[in-house]
């Protein structure tokens, strides 16, 4: 189970992103429009530091707009 704040690396990070983002998919670097001063890429953020659910969700792709 995903723990609130931890280091996530390798396949565990990929699997966690797939779980959190579901059908939306995800980016390993945030798209330009969503870049913040902290945009180091998710491996850098989660593996070399630590990350929480909120941070993981910022790497999910934007859901397609429905009519």
């Amino acid at each position: 189970a995903y723990r609130p704040s931890e280091t996530l690396c390798g396949g565990e990070l990929v699997d966690t992103l797939q779980f959190v983002c579901g059908d939306r998919g995800f980016y390993f670097s945030r798209p330009a429009s969503r870049v913040s001063r902290r945009s180091r890429g998710i491996v850098e953020e989660c593996c070399f530091r630590s990350c929480d659910l909120a941070l993981l969700e910022t790497y999910c792709a934007t859901p397609a707009k429905s009519e």
Partner: antibody
Framework: QVQLVQSGAEVKKPGASVKVSCKAS????????MHWVRQAPGQGLEWMGI????????SYAQKFQGRVTMTRDTSTSTVYMELSRLRSDDTAVYYC?????????????WGQGTTVTVSS | DIQMTQSPSSLSASVGDRVTITCRAS??????LNWYQQKPGRAPDLLIN???SLQSGVPSRFSGSGSGTDFTLTISSLQPEDFATYFC?????????FGGGTKVEIK
Amino acid sequence: QVQLVQSGAEVKKPGASVKVSCKASGYTFTSYYMHWVRQAPGQGLEWMGIINPSGGSTSYAQKFQGRVTMTRDTSTSTVYMELSRLRSDDTAVYYCARDVQWLAYGMDVWGQGTTVTVSS
Amino acid sequence: DIQMTQSPSSLSASVGDRVTITCRASQSISSYLNWYQQKPGRAPDLLINAASSLQSGVPSRFSGSGSGTDFTLTISSLQPEDFATYFCQQSYSLPFTFGGGTKVEIK
């Protein structure tokens, strides 16, 4: 072609330090993480740590924490691994190896290895 | 840390034989398992990643399977150049860990 070229063999005394270099060519140096792996004579492979050549961030195996330092020089596309307080059981071949992607899919390009011998 | 246990540690086989090497993880690693081949005096070469994905240039006689904790490397028809040591490695979580190796020798 994609290549990692390591520095030459070293002979060190116990307690000394060694610094091994690994020069990358044939690809964008800052786009791939770099691992260091060692292999004692006749033994298996042991992962030591990883460096992000882009930002310089590192993560080390607990066993080497406090004794190993990994650095990089983007101007020469070179990563370095320094191991201090050497002991006889640090005698090994040290390899740098490029990560495939996202730290999830192995190491696809390896240096030729650097033999480090620790002996009094 | 995740422990990787390889078996057998060595085996003797003849050219043309089908060879199977197994690797077991101490906890589930999904499909994040890589296989390497190492010849004496050389660096390892990545053969297979993600449990079953053959690397470019690797002969199709090599195949990998498994997920969770149990994985297999199969050489369908052993060739003279395949006599080497094979290592598995998990890339599920840090620290990355390797199996102890399987040395494939000529019978």
